[in-house]
């Protein structure tokens, strides 16, 4: 079942997602979604990475990390009850079949009449505590014309890292990283 | 227009090999997602494979996994789906379709008129 | 795998009715649906994707609905053009499938 995140009306959202780049710039493709993650890709894209760059947005969604260290957690504007839902985020490693994929399940809350005097974002995650490792053998990697040739090597969690105080005060939240090579 | 033109099948003997080609045209190639599909003499379709647009990313269903290899030259914008281990179930009409993805996933909106591979013993 | 259940195998239909071809996918696919129709001798041409979204050029006459499990593929006022076979296909999950087909005969 996909991770549970709350926000406020009117206020920012975050939605966490996180991989370790092989090496600086050697960036994977990224896309986010509005929906579950389909088959391949992403459905109702609202951003997305090439292995450069962000190379594609809709206006509100933009990731407020340094995506250039696999920060990719997608940051949604002045949300809306019609924000609530499920987003994908699929980070495209290359080689055969190797894409991970996230489910994100964001819940909108009416704005409080009296808002608190000092926290006024209430963002919860809660990722899974464990993910699966994969082994790659040579069978799996895939050697790329233009891009690194990488392989997917662990998978760990980050439980209730402060982040991004800019943000939000005491912004907490727990993600999953993806580390490659 | 939007033209895909596969080539490349024809009758081979069990445990044989084969490798098709799909010439694309009438779009930018490198833009799209690019699959195979076939259809068997019952008219059931199946997915065989797909690749992303820089090439990247492969992905196949676990009845051809370990032997259809998937590739594309965005060069010469063609597809390619290299067939090894052939048994009867790979008898079938291979149809390479291409795949819109960057603002939304859209599965297979341009088929080309296929080619006849027959597997025989 | 994602099975995709499609009823009827077979349909009699005449110019001008109303059809309607379900499909059943035996887990939840979101609306990652998308239909197909196929002429004899031809490939497939895609009808519908997103479960009711219509490509370019289909003819409204042609109407998706559903979302979870069920879906619908309804072709009002038939017209003889539409005599074809009909798939469906998710794209929720690996491996995508297909249904097995609906074939729309005449009368």
């Known amino acids: 079942s996909e991770v549970e995140y709350r926000a406020e009306v009117g206020q920012n959202a975050y939605l966490p997602c996180f991989y370790t780049p092989a090496a600086p710039g050697n960036l994977v493709p990224v896309c986010w979604g509005k929906g579950a993650c389909p088959v391949f890709e992403c459905g109702n894209v609202v951003l997305r990475t090439d292995e450069r760059d962000v190379n594609y947005w809709t206006s509100r969604y933009w990731l407020n990390g340094d995506f250039r260290k696999g920060d990719v957690s997608l940051t949604i504007e002045n949300v809306t009850l019609a924000d609530s839902g499920i987003y994908c985020c699929r980070i495209q490693i290359p080689g055969i079949m190797n894409d991970e994929k996230f489910n994100l399940k964001l819940v909108i809350k009416p704005a409080k009449v009296t808002p608190a005097p000092t926290r006024q974002r209430d963002f919860t995650a809660a990722f899974p505590r464990m993910l699966t490792t994969r082994g790659h053998g040579p069978a799996e990697t895939q050697t790329l014309g233009s891009l690194p040739d990488i392989n997917l090597t662990q998978i760990s969690t980050l439980a209730n890292e402060l982040r991004d105080s800019r943000l939000a005060n005491d912004l907490r939240d727990s993600g999953a990283t993806i580390r490659i090579g | 227009e939007v033209m895909l033109m596969e080539s490349g099948g024809g009758l081979v003997k069990l445990g044989g090999s084969l490798k098709l080609s799909c010439a694309a045209s009438?779009?930018?190639?490198?833009?799209?997602?690019m699959s195979w599909v076939r259809q068997t003499p019952e008219k059931r379709l199946e997915w065989v494979a797909t690749?992303?647009?820089?090439?990247?990313?492969?992905y196949y269903p676990d009845s051809v996994k370990d032997r259809f290899t998937i590739s594309r030259d965005n060069a010469k914008n063609t597809l390619y789906l290299q067939m090894s281990s052939l048994n009867s179930e790979d008898t079938a009409v291979y149809y390479c379709?291409?795949?819109?993805?960057?603002?939304?996933?859209?599965?297979?909106?341009?088929w080309g008129q296929g080619t006849s591979v027959t597997v025989s013993s | 795998s994602i099975v995709m259940t499609q009823t009827p195998k077979f349909m009699s239909t005449s110019v001008g009715d109303r059809v309607s071809v379900t499909c059943k996918a035996s887990q939840y696919v979101d609306t990652y649906v998308a239909w197909y129709q196929q002429k004899p001798g031809q490939s497939p041409k895609p009808l519908i994707y997103s479960a009711s979204t219509r490509h370019t050029g289909v003819p409204a006459r042609f109407t998706g609905s559903g979302s979870g499990t069920d879906f619908t593929l309804t072709i009002s006022n038939v017209q003889s053009e539409d005599l074809a076979e009909y798939f469906c296909a998710q794209y929720s999950s690996s491996p995508l499938t297909f249904g097995a087909g609906t074939k729309l005969e005449l009368k």
């Open positions: 009438g779009f930018t190639f490198s833009s799209y997602y």
């Open positions: 690749i992303s647009n820089s090439g990247g990313s492969t």
């Open positions: 379709a291409r795949d819109p993805y960057y603002t939304n996933y859209v599965p297979m909106d341009y």
